[in-house]
């Protein structure tokens, strides 16, 4: 069973009184429809809440919106609907919050059918004031902020026009027509695809990829025969149609599309897809769908150029229908990812990698749990994690796995213990070491969140009945206390805490229902008095990440270095505080063959760490194309894994081979690219 409230648990003294003094209720005086909540800025305490109520009438939809603002993390709210002239706000566009601490907010309003364009309300002072602006177009998408300059906005119109504003939505200019997809790149660059003939759908695979680096003054065609494109880390990817047939291949650029290389990945047919699962400045995880409606594919990991790919995981679950994958980046520990595979018997199993996709294993069985009915052997089984796929299948899983970069090592997830994911009601499990070991934390499904960089974990039971109890733990989920936050239970709809897990406030959202009325209500609880003092040096202990065998000289080495962290002791009840910075100390490891991947034209035979030359491309889908031309490629067969920092040790030296590979790309080479100016 999971740990609970017993004598063995270190109970927080007088917590009921402390929390009661810091529990704030707010009742929203409007009809219950939908509610959306956004945090404006970081550490500002500003929250915007938009409630909308729809009445579908015969000819039209009547709607009413209300906008509320809090500047104390949700303890008090003020109705500011008059600032947006009591206008009905389109919830499908949400609230477009500006990057960083710009304080910018854009709300898109519903306008009557005959109007020339849409309407937005803009604020640049953390929603204290709003300016109404009528648009010269009807927006199709939410306004997109440039990551570099929050005054620059991008939007697509319902007529496929690409519109740009340079003064935070005050004035708009259409910079291109016939646009299908547009994205901000780095340095205020815009990438977009265009169609020539009928429509985006009709021209799929015959689109052009364009770039503008000056907000639409001039343009450059950087690709043709485009199916789609994507940005990940420093990589720009395009899937390009082949000349000969209906297949397409991935091409990659690391210079904003000036030059392209063909990625050494299998080509895909019409019914298949590529998906960038994760990317950073070092490498990318790419999913390549299997032919047929299998619901799975293969994960490949790239080299530092995004060109050479190593097979990472077979039978990776990724549904074609709903586009669901369980692929999760565990942000609380470097190199860790969790995902699901579809077994031959169609059962779903969870896999974890600790070395950025180098090796995948099952999750270790939690010590305090028994194997369930899915296990063939009652003593040998593993933990199966519920993520997006389980949620999409309407299993009793209220939340996806949770981890936070500043709560080192902590991973919280719903799961079951057996040989495969079970449809039975899951429990909540926690790992304090980034996924190496797990413990059952709570019985049954819960909503959960991390506060104060891991100093507090808060949970609420997932129930169809009204609730009035919140659970919290100050020791990374070992022991739990329960607090009744209201006498009158509410129908719970969500748990909200400021993104980044630095806050000590939690908001419980729900509604009350009586015979005639239904009202939104929020309870905000501040845990500051539970963590009475600031943490000191003595409250932290030293922890080596990725440690599996202290007798191994290189224990803890992942991607060429090991990291020691200062972590809060489980028994310390103190505040990390909003300014808490993770203290870590890296140390470089000696290189081994495992720090290298096999370069183009080489592969690793099963259970061998050496890279051997591939038999002359017989039966291998290996085409190499660099910069759109046939190239000479010199290699010694090994290439350092992206992000690997090892030094010394093994240095794989062998004669440098000159590989001349055929280049079958029909993609534009740089000299054929055209430019134009407005």
């Amino acid at each position: 069973s999971a740990p609970g409230e017993d004598e063995e648990c270190g109970r927080v003294r007088d917590f009921v009184a402390k929390l009661a003094n810091n529990t704030h209720q707010h009742v929203f005086d409007d009809l219950r429809g939908s509610v959306s909540l956004s945090w404006v800025g970081d550490s500002t305490g500003v929250i915007l809440v938009l409630t909308t109520f729809h009445v579908p009438l015969v000819i039209m939809t009547f709607g009413q919106s209300k906008l509320y603002r809090s500047e104390d993390y949700g303890k008090n709210f003020k109705d500011i609907t008059d600032l947006i002239n009591n206008t009905f706000i389109r919830t499908e566009f949400g609230m477009a919050i500006g990057p960083e601490n710009s304080g910018k907010v854009v709300l898109t309003a519903e306008v009557s059918g005959g109007s020339r364009g849409g309407r937005i309300f803009r604020s640049s002072d953390f929603a204290k004031n709003f300016v109404q602006t009528d648009l010269p177009f009807h927006p199709l998408t939410q306004m997109m902020y440039s990551p570099q300059n929050s005054d620059y906005l991008l939007a697509l119109s319902t007529e496929n026009g690409l519109w740009v504003s340079k003064n935070f939505g005050g004035k708009w200019e259409e910079i291109h027509k016939a646009v299908c997809l547009a994205k901000w790149g780095s340095d205020n660059t815009i990438f977009f695809t265009t169609y020539a003939n009928g429509s985006c759908k009709a021209d799929l695979g015959a689109l052009e990829l364009w770039r503008t680096s000056d907000l639409g003054k001039s343009f450059k065609t950087i690709g043709v025969k485009i199916y789609s494109f994507g940005l990940g880390g420093r990589f720009l990817f395009a899937s390009v149609m082949a000349d000969k047939d209906t297949t397409r291949r991935i091409h990659v650029s690391t210079d904003q599309g000036d030059t392209w290389s063909m990625a050494q990945l299998p080509s895909v047919g019409q019914e298949q897809f590529y998906s960038i699962l994760a990317a950073n400045d070092d490498m990318v995880f790419m999913h390549v769908d299997e032919p047929g409606d299998t619901g799975f594919g293969t994960i490949f990991t790239s080299d530092d150029r995004g060109i050479v790919y190593s097979k990472s995981l077979d039978r990776h679950l990724y549904t074609t229908t709903g586009g669901e994958t369980d692929f999760t980046n565990v942000t609380s520990l470097r190199g860790v990812y969790i995902t699901s595979v579809l077994s031959e018997d169609n059962s779903i199993q969870t896999m974890i990698t600790f070395d950025q996709g180098g090796r995948w294993t099952h999750l270790r069985k939690p010590e305090n749990s028994e194997c369930d009915a899915t296990a063939k052997n009652k003593n040998e089984c593993s933990l199966a994690i519920h993520a997006s796929y389980s949620i999409s299948q309407k299993l009793n899983v209220p939340m996806a796995p949770l981890s936070e970069p500043n709560a080192v090592g902590i991973v919280i997830a719903h799961g079951s213990v057996g040989d495969a994911i079970s449809v039975m009601v899951p429990d909540v499990y926690i790992s304090d070491d980034g996924g190496y070991s797990w413990t059952k934390m709570l019985e049954g499904p819960h909503y959960y969140t991390i506060l104060d960089s891991g100093g507090i974990i808060v949970a609420i039971e997932h129930s169809s009945r009204p609730i009035n109890v919140i659970k919290f733990s100050t020791d990374e989920g070992q022991c739990w206390q329960t607090y009744t936050f209201t006498r009158d239970p509410i129908y719970f709809t969500g748990l909200a805490s400021e993104p980044g897990a630095r806050s000590m406030n939690i908001s419980i959202w729900g509604f009350t229902e009586s015979f005639l009325t239904s009202q939104w209500v929020s309870y905000t609880i501040d845990f500051k008095d539970i963590l009475e003092r600031n943490c000191e040096e003595k409250d932290y202990t030293i922890w080596l990440a990725h440690s599996t065998d202290p007798e191994d000289y290189e224990d803890g080495c992942i991607l060429g270095y090991k990291e020691q962290f200062l972590r809060l002791r489980k028994s310390s009840v103190c505040q990390n505080g909003r300014d808490y910075v993770v203290t870590k100390q890296p140390s470089i490891c000696l290189c081994s063959l495992e720090d290298f991947l096999c370069d183009f034209g080489y592969y690793r035979p099963e259970n061998d760490s050496k890279c051997v030359e591939q038999p002359e491309l017989k039966g291998h889908d290996l085409e190499f194309c660099l910069y759109g031309r046939e190239e000479h490629l010199t290699t010694n067969g090994y290439r350092k894994i992206p992000g690997d920092k090892c030094q010394g040790g093994v240095n794989p030296v062998r004669e440098v081979k000159d590989l001349k590979k055929k280049c079958t790309s029909n993609f534009l080479s740089p000299e054929k690219q055209n430019s134009k100016s407005n």
């Epitope: 063995e8 648990c9 270190g10 070491d433 190496y436 070991s437 020791d475 070992q478 022991c479 003595k538 202990t541 030293i542 922890w543 080596l544 990440a545 990725h546 440690s547 202290p550 007798e551 191994d552 000289y553 224990d555 803890g556 090991k562 020691q564 002791r569 489980k570 028994s571 310390s572 100390q585 140390s587």
Partner: antibody, heavy 124, light 106 residues
């Protein structure tokens, strides 16, 4: 089998310093914390502080803060404990001990290997 | 710092007796407790770590239990070699030892 061998007995004058060494053999010295524990005649055990050779992270008991310095030399697999401003009540047997480790936590699993002890006598 | 209170300070027992030593922490230390045996003129020897895990090579007559603030070391059947002083040690805060329990011949 891991062994910790400490330097020989020392006789010191009040106000002076003493530096005791602890050399490890037969194991991966760098991956374990080394603690220093002392025991005054007829008294119990008292933890002074510890060090992790990788990165040289040291931490000290409040009582000895400012008076004790613990260091480690990875190349020779040796840990050192220096105690300054000696007084007669510092007369004790000083032990170095390896902190056992089953996970990434360095100090949580007890001290599984001990040195033979170094007697330090402080007398005028 | 976390204080560790060990009781009794002295315990008289005979060979074959079941012996229990308790240790109380001033605040919860989860399971981060170790037990040691020390004989005169010798270095301490680790018996139990993480409250109840037996160190390899230690006879199974030694067992540990407890979690949070209350811990117990039990010797199921006292042997002649077991007459010594026993210390508990917490590892969750800055390390502290209990005052010791001397097990002597009755």
């Amino acid at each position: 089998q891991v062994q910790l061998v400490q330097s020989g007995a020392e006789v010191k004058k009040p106000g002076s310093s003493v530096k005791v060494s602890c050399k490890a053999s037969g194991g991966t010295f760098r991956n374990y914390a080394i603690s220093w524990v002392r025991q005054a005649p007829g008294q119990g055990l008292e933890w002074m502080g510890g060090i992790i050779p990788i990165g040289g992270w040291a931490n000290y008991a409040q009582k000895f803060q400012g008076r004790v310095t613990i260091t480690a030399d990875e190349s020779t697999s040796t840990a050192y404990m220096e105690l300054s401003s000696l007084r007669s009540e510092d007369t004790a047997v000083y032990y170095c001990a390896r902190q056992g480790r089953k996970t990434g936590y360095y100090y949580y699993y007890g001290m599984d290997v001990w040195g033979q002890g170094t007697t330090v006598t402080v007398s005028s | 710092d976390i204080q560790m209170t060990q009781s009794p300070s002295t315990l008289s027992a005979s060979v074959g007796d079941r012996v229990t030593i308790t240790c109380r922490a001033s605040q919860s230390i989860s399971s981060w407790l170790a037990w040691y045996q020390q004989k005169p003129g010798k270095a301490p020897k680790l018996l139990i770590y993480k409250a109840s895990s037996l160190e390899s090579g230690v006879p199974s007559r030694f067992s540990g239990s407890g979690s949070g603030t209350e811990f117990t070391l039990t010797i199921s059947s006292l042997q002649p070699d077991d007459f010594a002083t026993y210390y508990c040690q917490q590892a969750d805060g800055h390390i502290t030892f209990g005052g010791g329990t001397k097990v002597e011949i009755k």
